[in-house]
């Protein structure tokens, strides 16, 4: 049966046993800035092109054991959530991956900046259709990272990022705090904000909307046919990147403002239990859970 | 995220170092009264001191970025400091990434075309 997260973002009209938009997102290229990925995984094989871009810090610790499957874990799962054959949102979208996070999931602001610059240069050299950039990472507030995101957004690129897993105000983190970026918090199957131990999804006025981010089934780098469930605002952001890819594929001329407006318009409203958020953040945090447009757009979205 | 709001700095630390009249013999001194600012991550454990993104003013050309980077290296060398230019930015933001001692920040902030300097910091998978 359909995984809960795909059911949650699918309009009632399409809730059959399977989530099968045949060609969702085929006009769109999604760039993923994350860990290395297992590109020969059955879920994403032929859908993800691994670029030669790599800018990562050394791993921490004197006795760190580098295992390919662990190095690829985070990125492989997210690529699967965006465009995986069986468990992906935008099954028609093509992806390009840049490695900016090391085997321990750690990167740098400077490495991320150079990655964003690489995307801009690629866009200038070979203009294609609409571009979505997925940034499933967060650090402290960074003026320069936010500025780079702003410039890329003004060049017509849609940037989607994780709100952060710190149970804190997303405005204190980057790129989550960049106004031009679509910032995504995480909710669970009960439409509750996701708790991750003592921590959990970030919140506040820098979050644009929420999306499924707990127990999300996706490609596991343990083997080429393995699946695993992962949780976090990265998974939530991957859902929105997939939805954005489908919307842009249906309407390639959408501006960032129009796309943001559509994402909000088609979201489920007031379903999140706001009691989880600190009192002073409740009114500032959007009560929106991302969803695909309903059947009135059938000809556009499910061609 | 969330458009239509003023930029949020949060606990972001900003250190403003005023430019002085002494310009170290530079041909292109910055406009009178401007200040370049230094920024670093508010979360100390995520800071990466020793690597800095020097962001230049918006209309700065690549050749000017390269010249500014070389000038920083020359001035640092005169003071006995080694520096390494790791990357020159162009396409999104003009500027360069430099590995250097924090002792050189005051000097770097006085270079022509400099808008602000940010210390590198960590980001994490979410």
């Amino acid at each position: 049966s359909i995984p809960w997260n795909l059911e949650r973002i699918t309009p009632p009209r399409y809730r059959a046993d399977e989530y099968q938009p045949p060609d969702g997102g085929s006009l769109v290229e999604v760039y993923l800035l994350d860990t290395s990925i297992q590109s020969d995984h059955r879920e994403i094989e032929g859908r993800v092109m691994v670029t030669d871009f790599e800018n990562v810090p050394e791993e921490d610790g004197t006795r760190f054991h580098r295992q390919a499957s662990k190095c690829d874990s985070h990125g492989t799962h997210l690529a699967g959530v965006v465009s995986g054959r069986d468990a992906g949102v935008a099954k028609g979208a093509s992806m390009r991956s840049l490695r900016v996070l090391n085997c321990q999931g750690k990167g740098t602001v400077s490495g991320t900046l150079i990655g964003l610059e690489f995307i801009r240069k690629s866009q200038l050299v070979q203009p294609v259709g609409p571009l979505v950039v997925l940034l499933p990472l967060a650090g402290g507030y960074s003026r320069v990272l936010n500025a780079a995101c702003q410039r890329l957004a003004r060049a017509g690129v849609v940037l989607v990022t994780a709100a952060g897993n710190f149970r804190d105000d997303a405005c204190l983190y980057s790129p989550a705090s960049a106004p031009e970026v679509i910032t995504v918090g995480a909710t669970n199957a009960q439409d509750q904000p996701v708790t991750l131990g003592t921590l959990g999804t970030n919140f506040g006025r820098c979050v644009d909307l929420f999306a499924p981010g707990e127990d999300i089934i996706g490609a596991s780098s343990d083997c080429s046919t393995c699946f695993v469930s992962q949780s976090g605002t990265s998974q939530a952001a991957a859902h929105v990147a997939g939805i954005a890819a489908m919307m842009l594929s249906a309407e390639p001329e959408l501006t960032l403002a129009e796309l943001r407006q559509r994402l909000i318009h088609f979201s489920a409203k007031d379903v999140i239990n706001e009691a989880w958020f600190p009192e002073d953040q409740r009114v500032l945090t959007p009560n929106l859970v991302a969803a695909l447009p309903p059947s009135t757009h059938e000809n556009l979205y499910f061609q | 995220g969330a458009m239509g709001q003023e930029d949020e700095d949060g606990d972001y630390e900003e250190l403003v170092l005023a430019l002085r009249s002494e310009e170290d013999g530079l041909a292109e001194a910055p406009e009178h009264g401007t200040t370049a600012t230094f920024h670093r991550c508010a979360k100390d454990p995520w800071r990466l001191p020793g690597t800095y993104v020097v962001v230049l003013k918006e209309e700065t050309h690549l050749s000017q970025s390269e010249r500014t980077a070389r000038r920083l290296q020359a001035q640092a060398a005169r003071r006995g400091y080694l520096t390494k230019i790791l990357h020159v930015f162009h396409g999104l933001l003009p500027g360069f990434l430099v590995k250097m001692s924090g002792d050189l920040l005051e000097l770097a902030l006085k270079l022509p075309h400099v808008d602000y300097i940010e210390e590198d910091s960590s980001v994490f998978a979410q």
């Epitope: 006795r63 760190f64 662990k70 874990s73 321990q104 710190f166 131990g197 003592t198 921590l199 | 454990p45």
Partner: antibody, heavy 122, light 110 residues
Amino acid sequence: QVQLVESGGGVVQPGRSLRLSCAASGFTFSSFGMHWVRQAPGKGLEWVALIWNDGSNKYYADSVKGRFTISRDNSKNTLYLQMNSLRAEDTAVYYCARAIAALYYYYGMDVWGQGTTVTVSS
Amino acid sequence: QSVLTQPPTVSAAPGQKVTISCSGSSSNIGNNFVSWYQQLPGTAPKLLIYDYNKRPSGIPDRFSGSKSGTSATLGITGLQTGDEADYYCGTWDSSLSGYVFGTGTRVTVL
């Protein structure tokens, strides 16, 4: 609910070995780093060891380095501490504790077990 | 020998405020996140504060944390008899590549 239960403590002679276990329940064990912390009778807390969520990195206090080994079996939701060449000064209550997060292991510990007592005596 | 120094005891009357200091160095408190733990008599420690000043859910706002340079402080306002316990600061030490706890402070309610 979230729970950590230590076992394997007991009385052991100096120079001998002991293996402690910590059974985790109520949370996704494989998503969190795990620590061992000990407390000698009437003394303060002393950190012993840390293992990352995927087992890829291990850290030890100088006082136990080379004698103790931390490990985990994510399929069994269990954390272990293999203690060799035990000394009288290793006598303590041993707690397992969950790291606040996988990547930000230096944040501290948010869930603690009730502890198991190890007595090293001849 | 702990690298984080705390006062052995602090005491105050019910309803009063107490502060506990934790002094370290640049390799620990100066550049790493500080947590505070409460250990009631005969029980396991419990997390009170993490990331210098954040409280886990269920911890009352009578407990607060702050950091300045290489020192951290735990504040307890509206002191109650149930607050009688040992309190420990803790942080990562980059030089030691390990976690370190403070020497511990016993809080007594007069």
